[in-house]
Amino acid sequence: AVNGTSQFTCFYNSRANISCVWSQDGALQDTSCQVHAWPDRRRWNQTCELLPVSQASWACNLILGAPDSQKLTTVDIVTLRVLCREGVRWRVMAIQDFKPFENLRLMAPISLQVVHVETHRCNISWEISQASHYFERHLEFEARTLSPGHTWEEAPLLTLKQKQEWICLETLTPDTQYEFQVRVKPLQGEFTTWSPWSQPLAFRTKPAALGKDT
């Protein structure tokens, strides 16, 4: 066998994108590799070129159609192959039978906005992007707030165990700058994982009124 270790991991965004990462110890950075997708019950097949993302890791996106089109369902199986060029031929490096709705990672939430801000409270809303209608309300969210002098890793996680696209942050400090992020995960799928964190939303609480206790 080829020396070292390798890993091939793919996720479906629930609509029209399968993102894959291939890593192999000792593989040359300029190795030319591709991912091929062959669905078991669709007329199309798709290929993407793996591009380096780190020393021994490559990634690519299989774009199956328009961003909001529903290209796969719970009954689909897609056979995914990693092929790398060796001289004049392509060598199969890995093969995976991929059940899209067992391997979900949604797009990061978008359109974060402050709905209402006070001295100690802030109401924030967001939207989910390119999420399948199949989920109906079977989604959960995690949110975190960056306070001054802390890191994101130190921020406590707030869990929303339902499809709730808003949050009311409380016990905030007046006249203070904060940042807020949220991520989403479907309840379905053995290998499903959290979406990336949203872009941070910066906001500032209102100053306390002069002469009043805070």
Epitope: G4, T5, S6, F8, D40, T79, V92, I95, Q96, D97
Partner: nanobody, 121 residues
């Protein structure tokens, strides 16, 4: 606990056929690709063949293509490797392995103990 148990190895003559098998615990068998690796004395572990768990897509090393056939019996949680036209260079300890992917690297998640295949010239 995952169990992979090989059987069917033995001593055969060059040109003969042999079928080795691998029994797996149910959860592994229904959720993982299965494969065969081999290790000859003094050599590195070599990928032989693999089969995926849902579509039974197969992949073979060039050295065995056309001679070996991998298959799986889902009703019995068993995988087989039918080896025809065996050659002395096929002599090795044959390992059954399971992983989410067929990979040509020998870092699969689960391994059996191995069954010895010896091909005499």
């Amino acid at each position: 606990q995952v169990q992979l148990q090989e059987s069917g190895g033995g001593l055969v003559q060059a040109g003969d056929s042999l079928r080795i098998s691998c029994a797996a615990s149910g959860r592994i068998f229904s959720n993982y690709a299965m494969g065969w690796f081999r290790q000859a004395p003094g050599k590195e572990t070599e990928f032989v063949a693999g089969i995926t768990h849902l579509t039974s897509t197969t992949h073979y090393a060039d050295s065995v293509k056309g001679r070996f056939t991998i298959s799986r019996d889902n009703a019995k949680n068993t995988m087989h490797l039918q080896m025809n036209n065996l050659k002395p260079e096929d002599t090795a300890l044959y390992y059954c392995a399971a992983d989410r992917n067929i990979k040509i690297t020998a870092d699969w998640s689960y391994w059996g103990q191995g069954t010895q295949v010896t091909v005499a010239s």
